[in-house]
């Protein structure tokens, strides 16, 4: 039994880091493998992660962490019984994938303005809370070409757009994702999408 693709890990910079790797053949990850991880810190103890299958030869492990600060560094040991298959380290702050925003809501009752709001996925005491920026994706269910991205570079989790920038009388969907420039993170997953029917009063034309 050998590791074909070494574990790579990403952290949500809160409580979970996810590590994925591939073995050189079909593997029952949960019965054959264990990933031991330990914070490099005085008096810390090793923890064991039981991996799950992620495709035939792929494994994934969700490492639980109390919290994360930028100086944290973990040792990782991948074991198959008594055999050490791989040894490495992981610094969560250098491999951050933020949590996805939640509670995306479209408010359509504000004159002819659409107000989109969502929730920051981090508590106020987490460093990322004040460092997230967002991308909002809006698309038409009727017209695949009607697809747009709005970059929200301010901290407030909201976006206002004129309803008239979208077509009237058809349904749209929106979703939002986040990233943090300070840690050069990857983008989060998209939030669940929300749907609304876009309608607004056409301006009265005088001839």
């Amino acid at each position: 039994m050998k590791v074909l693709q070494e574990p790579t890990c990403v952290s949500d910079y809160m409580s979970i880091s996810t590590c994925e790797w591939k073995m050189n053949g079909p593997t029952n990850c949960s019965t054959e493998l264990r990933l031991l991880y330990q914070l490099v810190f005085l008096l810390s103890e090793a923890h064991t992660c039981i991996p799950e299958n992620n495709g035939g030869a792929g494994c994934v492990c969700h490492l639980l962490m109390d919290d994360v600060v930028s100086a944290d560094n973990y040792t990782l040991d991948l074991w198959a019984g008594q055999q050490l298959l791989w040894k490495g380290s992981f610094k969560p702050s250098e491999h951050v994938k933020p949590r996805a925003p939640g509670n995306l809501t479209v408010h359509t009752n504000v004159s002819d303005t659409l107000l989109l709001t969502w929730s920051n996925p981090y508590p106020p005491d987490n460093y990322l809370y004040n460092h997230l920026t967002y991308a909002v994706n809006i698309w038409s269910e009727n017209d695949p070409a009607d697809f747009r991205i709005y970059n929200v570079t301010y901290l407030e989790p909201s976006l206002r757009i004129a309803a008239s920038t979208l077509k009237s009388g058809i349904s749209y969907r929106a979703r939002v994702r986040a990233w943090a420039q300070c840690y050069n993170t990857t983008w989060s997953e998209w939030s669940p999408s929300t749907k609304w029917h876009n309608s607004y009063r056409e301006p009265f034309e005088q001839h």
Epitope: V40, F41, L42, S44, D66, D67, V69, A71, N73
Partner: nanobody, 115 residues
């Protein structure tokens, strides 16, 4: 220059309590308490990470000692309850920029547990 000033040591009866303090001139990733009993090697007792939410203890003091830090004052504390004669030692505050926690040391404060 980093300065660590400990206080709070003294003589206490078995089963009693003491609270040690350590004022640090700066913020550190790792802050810890070590102790050295007469004729023994210095050993780690408890440690705490920056942010103050994650704490770590030696097995011999788990459930009896509590480490905490006040980040606004850069002060480290060790609340010691249910003290035993074997807790008698010089207690040292130490801080570090990494998880080893041994970059800078205080001068030590003596804790004596005796009836």
């Amino acid at each position: 220059q980093v300065q660590l000033v400990e206080s709070g040591g003294g003589l206490v009866q078995p089963g009693g309590s003491l609270r040690l303090s350590c004022a640090a001139s700066g913020d550190f990733y790792c802050m810890a308490w070590f102790r050295q009993a007469p004729g023994k090697e210095r050993e780690a007792v408890a440690a705490i990470r920056s942010g103050g939410r994650s704490t770590y203890y030696a097995d011999s003091v788990k459930g009896r000692f509590t480490i905490s830090r006040d980040n606004s004052k850069n002060t480290l504390y060790l609340q010691m309850n249910s003290l035993k004669a074997e807790d008698t030692a010089v207690y040292y505050c130490a801080v570090g920029v990494d998880g080893n926690c041994r970059n800078y040391w205080g001068q030590g404060t003596l804790v004596t547990v005796s009836s």
